[in-house]
């Protein structure tokens, strides 16, 4: 007996025994009613899920913030939060992330967000800029649609001092109902709902309550979500008595909320730990739960119904759950504007002393080599440029989205992803010398397929089973164009089966398309310069040393032959030893790229967020005048468009960064044809960032 206990102890302490994995999701409840529903949830799930499936345990805490702390401390696993609290959950030391989103509307067209709106009575005759002195109805203090968004947007219009915020809001409106506010310290916030009760006992609490506050004539404006009006007024004639206030100082009918809202707000979201957060288990649990107890599924227990209250555990208006892409952190999920609004509310920034000084541009550098060049640029720029590092291009794009970085230059394939993620192109790399380089954006460069002249039987039509070399997955010349053409031919995405092996940095590590790569250890097949076969030069090197075909740009071969690249692998190469594959099945010499290419590719472009566009544009134009191709001696001076290890930060053949004129969106910049081609290839996309961004903006 003693022996058995000892053995169990060893198992418990060292975790050495093959224990059954813990498949319990500890759900956090914030009230007696929620705890009751949670227990019912637990019991009903037990009755329908096999014993080896996910199960529910219930943990009761006093508040959502206590739940957030409990999850961070591994005392609970999941809770559903309003968007405002998702931000709190994200902040250190909590570090939680969104894992499952509630959706509204139909399964075919699921809405994972709602619109925060300002509703008024049709005959009230005031506009957004006349809200001061009006009476306001809020869903609750600190809630997204009812408080954070409207007050975040109005923040700089509030009377000074703006701290405490409740006092400033109380002085801005002539009276309010803001449930959950401190009625003792801020009686004006409770003027329209004595006591400011923080539950449904207060008739003006929550979405329906705030709307009732307006409907009863207590308030002049209600800050709610777009569906509140429809949920509370079934009759169109009744709805027609109300309008929405738009940010442009106009009004619109309530059904035009897509063109007249304060913000687009992510829906109620389940959060979990970023590390070891059981996100797959939580999804498995909720997915099974919605199958058995979702909308119109069961009489005995309903996930989206609260007989003992309202919105218990989940919103009563929810129709189901969607898995949040694993790539998404809270900042990305909430969106840059929403996060900025909350941050502004908390940090209290306003243009009191208007300034147009551009803050330093934070450039995103990939891996070690780019960071070294960026740091050199930063020193030479005397503080105009700062550097931020990331391991992959997608990590950089994510950092630009959430404000940790501001800009970087991207291949067209990544301009597409960045565009889908809400970034904008601001300047284009230009590769042709001309008198007016900065004003003359080019049509693009050519994507080509290069082979060794000695492999004389190789053509575009018999590439199956050959060894391929790519700049990286998701890049234009190295992936999107050749794989897009290939997809049209083979009608499937199993490119790793089409080629016998290859190097396509960014592929799954166990893929045959990582087999030819040369990076050591963890750097093998990584989409950055730590992988020797990454980028244009890397893909060409891969062809020289191991491959049958390289997908690169038309300048790659001349740039690395005839002694132009002094590296040992390249110094003795001759351009005449290579040929191009043409789409008609013929081959041509390298210099005949204009008549033998796969497609024209858009030039690389600098991308940024909309709000940084002007500063990035201005500072980069200054920087290229100082360090651009006008600098003749790069041995003693910093040169922006030169690299030790090829194409660092910008392509080395960049002559200047050119204005885009009217090609100032990613669609216009890339062109309809290319956008369509990449769109088709999205079926094959392994981009977790693209998945995450199209989750917010389909």
């Amino acid at each position: 007996m003693r022996l058995a206990v000892g053995a169990l102890l060893v198992c418990a302490v060292l975790g050495l025994c093959l224990a059954v994995p813990d498949k319990t999701v500890r759900w956090c409840a914030v009230s007696e009613h929620e705890a009751t529903k949670c227990q019912s949830f637990r019991d009903h799930m037990k009755s329908v899920i096999p014993s080896d499936g996910p199960s529910v345990a219930c943990v009761k805490k006093a508040s959502y913030l206590d739940c957030i702390r409990a999850i961070a401390a591994n005392e609970a696993d999941a809770v559903t939060l309003d968007a405002g609290l998702v931000y709190d959950a994200y902040l250190a030391p909590n570090n939680l992330k969104p894992v499952v989103a509630e959706f509204y509307g139909s399964k075919e067209d699921p809405q994972t967000f709602y619109y925060a709106v300002a509703v008024v009575k049709k005959d009230s005759g005031f506009q957004m800029n006349q809200l001061r002195g009006k009476k306001s109805c809020h869903t609750g203090l600190g809630r997204s649609a009812g408080w954070n968004i409207p007050i975040g947007l109005l923040y700089c219009d509030l009377p000074e001092p703006r701290k405490p915020l409740e006092k400033a809001v109380a002085n801005f409106f002539s009276g309010s109902c803001a449930p959950c506010a401190d009625g003792t310290d801020f009686p004006q916030l409770c003027q329209l709902c004595p006591g400011c009760g923080c539950s449904t006992l207060n008739q003006y609490f929550g979405y329906s309550g705030a709307f009732k506050c307006l409907k009863d004539g207590a308030g002049d404006v209600a800050f709610v979500k777009h569906s509140t009006i429809f949920e509370n007024l079934a009759n169109k004639a009744d709805r027609d008595q109300y309008e929405l206030l738009c940010l442009d100082n106009t009004r619109k009918p309530v059904d035009e909320y897509k063109d007249c809202h304060l913000a687009q707000v992510p829906s109620h979201t389940v959060v979990a730990r970023s590390m070891g957060g059981k996100e797959d288990l939580i999804w498995e649990l909720l997915n099974q739960a919605q199958e058995h107890f979702g909308k119109d599924k069961s009489k005995e227990f309903q996930l989206f119904s609260s007989p003992h209250g309202k919105d218990l555990l989940f919103k009563d208006s929810a129709h189901g759950f969607l898995k949040v892409p694993p790539r998404m952190d809270a900042k990305m999920y909430l969106g840059y504007e929403y996060v900025t609004a909350i941050r502004n509310l908390r940090e209290g920034t306003c243009p009191e002393a208007p300034t147009d000084e551009c803050k330093p541009v934070k450039w995103c550098a990939l891996s070690h080599h780019e960071r070294l060049k960026c740091d050199e640029w930063s020193v030479n720029s005397v503080g105009k440029i700062e550097c931020v590092s990331a391991e992959t291009t997608e990590d950089c794009i994510a950092k630009i989205m959430n404000g940790e970085a501001d800009a970087m230059s991207l291949d067209g394939g990544f301009v597409y992803i960045a565009g889908k993620c809400g970034l904008v192109p601001v300047l284009a790399e230009n590769y042709n010398k001309s008198d007016n380089c900065e004003d003359t954006p080019e049509a693009g460069y050519f994507a080509i397929a290069v082979v060794k002249k000695s492999a004389s039987d190789l053509t575009w039509d018999n590439l199956k089973g050959k060894k391929s070399c790519h700049t990286a997955v998701g890049r234009t010349a190295g992936w999107n164009i050749p794989m897009g053409l290939l997809y049209n031919k083979i009608n499937h995405c199993r490119f790793d089966e089409f080629f016998s092996e290859g190097c396509a940095p960014g592929s799954k590590k166990d893929s045959s398309l990582c087999k030819l790569c040369m990076g050591s250890g963890l750097n093998l097949c990584e989409p950055n310069n730590k992988e020797g076969y990454y980028g244009y030069t890397g893909a060409f090197r891969c062809l020289v040393e191991k491959g049958d075909v390289a997908f690169v740009k038309h300048q790659t071969v001349p740039q690395n032959t005839g002694g132009k690249n002094p590296d040992p692998w390249a110094k003795n190469l001759n351009e005449k030893d290579y040929e191009l594959l043409c789409l008609d099945g013929t081959r041509k010499p390298v210099e005949e790229y204009a008549n033998c290419h796969l497609a024209r590719a858009p030039n690389h472009a600098v991308v940024t967020r909309k709000d940084k566009e002007a500063c990035v544009h201005k500072i980069l134009r200054q920087q290229q005048h100082l360090f651009g191709s006008n600098v003749t001696d790069c041995s003693g001076n910093f040169c922006l468009f030169r690299s030790e290890t090829k194409d660092l930060l910008f392509r080395d053949d960049t002559v200047c960064l050119a204005k885009l004129h009217d090609r100032n969106t990613y669609e216009k910049y890339l062109g309809e044809e290319y956008v369509k081609a990449v769109g088709n290839l999205r079926k094959c996309s392994t981009s977790s960032l693209l998945e995450a961004c199209t989750f917010r903006r389909p």
């Epitope: 947007l153 219009d157 940010l247 442009d248 100082n249 147009d356 909309k610 002007a614 204005k659 969106t665």
Partner: nanobody, 125 residues
Framework: DVQLVESGGGSVQAGGSLRLSCTAS????????MAWFRQAAGKQREWVSW???????GYADSVKGRFTISRDNAKNTLYLDMTSLKPEDTAMYYC???????????????????WGQGTQVTVSS
């Protein structure tokens, strides 16, 4: 750096006119929403007018019919033509830009991310 510089302010009698200009240097503002705000001494800054890239405009009720906003994208310049001026129009006038693609405009201060230093307009009775 990127700058918005207002000019054209001054003193004028009630009923008179003024034209304010705001020149943007360092960037073409064709995709920004541009606006004028004003702040009277001891008062809160208030929105006056906005103009979208496509030329659509919006005005506060207090200036409707008297003020006209316009922009010349080729010259990177925003204008505010003020007629039938009243003593209550006395204020510091600020030019502001919001980078949102230029397809939508706002009346709220917090949505504008670039501001000029202002030009004073004084209307005496």
């Amino acid at each position: 750096d990127v700058q918005l510089v207002e000019s054209g302010g001054g003193s004028v009698q009630a009923g008179g006119s003024l034209r304010l200009s705001c020149t943007a240097s360092g960037y073409t503002y064709s995709r920004a929403c541009m606006a004028w705000f004003r702040q009277a001494a001891g008062k809160q800054r208030e929105w006056v007018s906005w103009i979208i890239a496509d030329g659509s405009t919006g005005y506060a009720d207090s200036v409707k019919g008297r003020f006209t906003i316009s922009r010349d994208n080729a010259k990177n310049t925003l204008y505010l033509d003020m007629t039938s001026l009243k003593p209550e129009d006395t204020a510091m006038y600020y030019c502001a830009a919001a980078y949102n693609g230029g397809d939508r405009c706002y009346t709220l201060i917090g949505l504008y991310n670039h501001w000029g230093q202002g030009t004073q307009v004084t209307v005496s009775s």
